[in-house]
């Protein structure tokens, strides 16, 4: 993430004929010119803006990392949507990288949920039915992960 992405410069457009508080804004897919008079299109496939704005620059498109697949490309109004490759997932508490899914559950547990691009396999104790989310010290069975279809932009 660049400084531009975190804190884009802002400026309200000076226009003589003001009819609304939002008049100095540019539509999604654009940013405002240096002098605040014009709206300039973002560059297709390079940068984007998702809301009405007074940004002096559009936001840079995310590039999917190795280990990710591109679900949908960056347009001038929407960032790239990336997804973890089959057999890997992205955790909420570590969204910066895709982690390998476990291949099976520990002894005494059964698989109740497949590996998806946004979650590891889900295991529960055979008797109690309580979930287990730690690393598997021993594997009882090998499971084949099946990918899902989330639609969340990369961070």
């Amino acid at each position: 993430i660049t400084q531009q992405d975190l804190a884009p410069q802002q400026r309200v457009a000076p226009q003589q004929k003001r009819s609304s508080p939002s008049e100095g804004l540019c539509p999604p897919g654009h940013h405002i010119s240096e002098d605040g008079r014009d709206c300039i299109s973002c560059k297709y496939g390079q940068d984007y803006s998702t809301h009405w704005n007074d940004l002096l620059f559009c936001l840079r498109c995310t590039r999917c990392d190795s280990g990710e697949v591109e679900l949908s490309p960056c347009t001038t109004t929407r960032n790239t949507v990336c997804q973890c490759e089959e057999g890997t997932f992205r955790e909420e508490d570590s969204p910066e990288m895709c982690r390998k899914c476990r291949t099976g559950c520990p002894r005494g547990m059964v698989k109740v949920g497949d590996c998806t691009p946004w979650s590891d396999i889900e295991c529960v104790h055979k008797e109690s039915g309580t979930k287990h989310s730690g690393e598997a010290p021993a594997v009882e069975e090998t499971v084949t992960s099946s990918p899902g279809t989330p639609a969340s932009p990369c961070s």
Partner: antibody, heavy 119, light 107 residues
Framework: KVQLQQSGAELVKPGASVKLSCKAS????????LHWVKQKSGQGLEWIGW????????KYNEKFKDKATLTADKSSSTVYMELSRLTSEDSAVYFC????????????WGQGTTLTVSS | DIVMTQSHKFMSTSVGDRVSITCKAS??????VAWYQQKPGQSPKLLIY???TRHTGVPDRFTGSGSGTDYTLTIKSVQAEDLTLYYC?????????FGGGTKLEIK
């Protein structure tokens, strides 16, 4: 079906004002930007400005900012353009057109309103 | 303001011919170019945007190309109904501006 229905032809005297309307239907009015475009007889097209009903954002082409005033009535899904201090130079066909909140190309157009300024 | 120049006001062609209509911008417009067709007494109709993306329902005989300042609309096999007026438009920076138009005529 998306439709932009414009008001009828106008014959107006020099110095007067006129208000043209464009009624939108077949889509969510507050999700698209509506524009006005001028076409003088036998000539090219000129972009006048936009009105976005979603946040009342207005932008004028500098050339028209003292000539045109854009407004809207959300209850009837209608945008208006008032042209003031009319001269023969304002005689033209005026189109309303819409675009999504993205690149500034126009996917649907009204049928046009012919304005004639003559004494 | 960016000036869009369509150097040919008229172009002669025949049904079945391939024809290319050109448009030159006074500065780089980063492929933010649209093309419209306008028939007499009608409103313009969007054909192409982002220089080469065909609008929904537009026949595939219409193709757009170009980058920087130079853009082209090509009709690969002209039909009788294509003999009309074409405009280019830059949607890169406001005020959005149009070319002066090119009228396709029968040879």
């Amino acid at each position: 079906k998306v439709q932009l229905q414009q008001s009828g032809a106008e014959l107006v005297k020099p110095g007067a004002s006129v208000k043209l309307s464009c009624k939108a239907s077949g889509y969510t009015f507050t999700e698209y930007i509506l524009h006005w475009v001028k076409q003088k007889s036998g000539q090219g097209l000129e972009w006048i400005g936009w009105f976005y009903p979603g946040n009342n954002n207005i932008k004028y082409n500098e050339k028209f900012k003292d000539k045109a005033t854009l407004t809207a009535d959300k209850s009837s899904s209608t945008v208006y353009m008032e042209l003031s201090r009319l001269t023969s130079e304002d005689s033209a066909v005026y189109f309303c057109a819409r675009h999504e909140q993205g690149p500034g190309y126009f996917d649907y157009w009204g049928q046009g309103t012919t304005l004639t300024v003559s004494s | 303001d960016i000036v869009m120049t369509q150097s040919h006001k008229f172009m002669s062609t025949s049904v079945g011919d391939r024809v290319s209509i050109t448009c030159k911008a006074s500065q780089d417009v980063n492929t933010a170019v649209a093309w419209y067709q306008q028939k007499p007494g009608q409103s313009p109709k969007l054909l192409i945007y982002w220089a080469s993306t065909r609008h929904t329902g537009v026949p595939d005989r219409f193709t757009g190309s170009g980058s920087g300042t130079d853009y082209t609309l090509t009709i690969k096999s002209v039909q009788a109904e294509d003999l009309t007026l074409y405009y280019c438009q830059q949607h890169y920076i406001t005020p959005w501006t149009f070319g002066g138009g090119t009228k396709l005529e029968i040879k």
